[in-house]
Interface confidence: low
């Protein structure tokens, strides 16, 4: 009997080992399939969303990453409250699982748009470096299903890059005009969103708890219209110390005013940045490494 029990334990352990190996193989197969797909895409056809089949619906890119899909690209997600799924770029580098909510790279998209466009989202949802805004509605659906960290990757025209990260990034609903809420800052670019860098400007430059404004829907704290003056939609105060949806200028100091892509604590108001990626991931995200 003792021998029998030991044999059972040995067999159970072997089964577990085999299960783990099968899982590892499944992950490898998924990765190879994706790599094959991406090699195909790299041959010229970037205009494809990676199809995960109807296996399940993913609430964000972290779930896709944890399900073994380790390749960056466009995927379809459906946050819990969202009525429909939508395409989004998933950044599977930098620890993986990042849902990209905004990208600026080359000025190919017009970011001087009205309320409806910013609400629903706009831009290039097919090309790797395509510029887009995911949409305030989608940001609300995403950030209310759990607590998210926002990471902002910034690059200037001198090949320097910095980042800013905020815990507990939340976007309110339509009734609250998609109000911005951010938590604790960390990073290398300075805290331009909360305006904590300078006691004099915080009352008018902080974006914390600001409602979203566009040229046709003015919710800022300025006697003029920030969105109209800065030609973009953003969580304007009076007006900004950060504006990542600003006018794209093809050079650092070509802006005639502070309406460029601005992150004050890095390069000041009159330097327009070369590229920006805004991406989110659950606060408690842990990569599922098998």
């Amino acid at each position: 009997l003792e021998d029998c029990a030991q044999e059972q334990m040995r067999l159970r352990a072997q089964v577990r080992l085999l299960e783990t190996r099968v899982k590892q193989q499944q992950v490898k197969i998924k990765q190879l399939l994706q790599e094959n797909e991406v090699q195909f895409l790299d041959k010229g056809d970037e205009n494809t969303v990676i199809d995960l089949g109807s296996k399940r619906q993913y609430a964000d890119c972290s779930e896709i990453f944890n399900d073994g899909y380790k390749l960056s690209g466009f995927y379809k997600i459906k946050p819990l409250q969202s009525p429909a799924e939508f395409s989004v770029y998933c950044d599977m580098s930098d620890g993986g699982g990042w849902t990209v909510i905004q990208r600026r790279s080359d000025g190919s998209e017009n970011f001087n748009r009205g309320w409806k466009d910013y609400e629903n989202g706009f831009g290039n949802f097919v090309q790797k470096h395509g510029e887009y805004w995911l949409g305030n509605k989608n940001l609300h659906f995403l950030t209310t299903q759990e607590d998210y960290t926002l990471k902002i990757d910034l690059a200037d025209f001198e090949k320097n890059s910095r980042y800013a990260q905020y815990k507990n990034f939340k976007v309110g609903d339509e009734k609250n005009f998609y109000e911005l809420n951010i938590g604790e800052y960390s990073g290398t670019a300075g805290d331009s969103l909360a305006g904590n860098f300078h006691p004099e400007v915080q009352w008018w430059a902080s974006h914390q708890r600001m409602k979203f404004s566009t040229w046709d829907r003015d919710h800022d704290n300025y006697e003029g219209n920030c969105a109209e003056e800065d030609q973009s939609g953003w969580w304007f105060n009076r007006c900004h110390s950060a504006n990542l949806n600003g006018v794209y200028y093809s050079g650092p100091y070509t802006a005639k005013t502070d309406n460029g892509i601005v992150w004050y604590t890095w390069h000041g108001w009159w330097y327009s940045l070369k590229s920006v990626v805004m991406k989110i991931r659950p606060n408690d995200f842990i990569p599922n490494v098998i």
């Epitope: 300078h198 006691p199 004099e200 400007v201 300025y222 003029g224 003056e229 005639k256 005013t257 604590t265």
Partner: antibody, heavy 115, light 107 residues
Framework: EVQLQQSGPELEKPGASVKMSCKAS????????MHWVKQRPGQGLEWIGM????????SYNQKFKGKATLTVDTSSSTAYMQLSSLTSEDSAVYYC????????WGQGTTLTVSS | DIVMTQSQKFMSTSVGDRVSVTCKAS??????VAWYQQKPGQSPKALIY???YRYSGVPDRFTGSGSGTDFTLTISNVQSEDLAEYFC?????????FGGGTKLEIK
């Protein structure tokens, strides 16, 4: 490009008043507070006060209350500083400067008070 | 008022050297300190804000450090064009106050 263009040098007699200007360009004038700083020859810098161009709210260094008066004309994007009851102690270079961090400065207006 | 003290009025250095300009606040100002460079006959130019952040276009040989009451501007690999007066300034509370300045002389 942001520019703060200040008016030319002034020579005044003791007891008189003077009004100097600072014309701003390259940004939305009503957005950012304008500060004024005094520098006497061979001496350090002294903050005089600031004005919010959007509503003309002012804040002064106690030392310059009654001496300096800050105003703006938003239609011409120009800030002004008037100094009254001039004495030789007021002879200095006066700068207008944009905050925060006083990162943009005018070229300065030299005031000489002499009988 | 917060008093900003730059104890050294003059500092002498040679091209290629490293020099540190110090500034002491009479009370805690956090990191709300800026540094300015003023060359003869010119307006001051902002170098550093928030104690350690360089403004755009400022060479990386200029480094700011410190918090609370003690602050330092370090210029490594001093160049002849660094001949100037350097001022610290606090913007933690009003009135804003400046240090008395430190003149850097190149031997």
């Amino acid at each position: 490009e942001v520019q703060l263009q200040q008016s030319g040098p002034e020579l005044e007699k003791p007891g008189a008043s003077v009004k100097m200007s600072c014309k701003a360009s390259g940004y939305t004038f009503t957005r950012y507070w304008m500060h004024w700083v005094k520098q006497r020859p061979g001496q350090g810098l002294e903050w005089i006060g600031m004005i919010d161009p959007s509503d003309s709210y002012t804040s002064y260094n106690q030392k310059f209350k009654g001496k300096a008066t800050l105003t703006v004309d938003t239609s011409s994007s120009t800030a002004y500083m008037q100094l009254s009851s001039l004495t030789s102690e007021d002879s200095a270079v006066y700068y207008c400067t944009l905050r925060p961090g006083l990162d943009y400065w005018g070229q300065g207006t030299t005031l000489t008070v002499s009988s | 008022d917060i008093v900003m003290t730059q104890s050294q009025k003059f500092m002498s250095t040679s091209v290629g050297d490293r020099v540190s300009v110090t500034c002491k606040a009479s009370q805690n100002v956090g990191t709300n300190v800026a540094w300015y460079q003023q060359k003869p006959g010119q307006s001051p130019k902002a170098l550093i804000y928030s104690a350690s952040y360089r403004y755009s276009g400022v060479p990386d040989r200029f480094t700011g450090s410190g918090s609370g009451t003690d602050f330092t501007l370090t210029i490594s690999n001093v160049q002849s064009e660094d001949l100037a007066e350097y001022f610290c300034q606090q913007y933690n509370s009003y009135p804003l106050t400046f240090g008395g300045g430190t003149k850097l002389e190149i031997k």
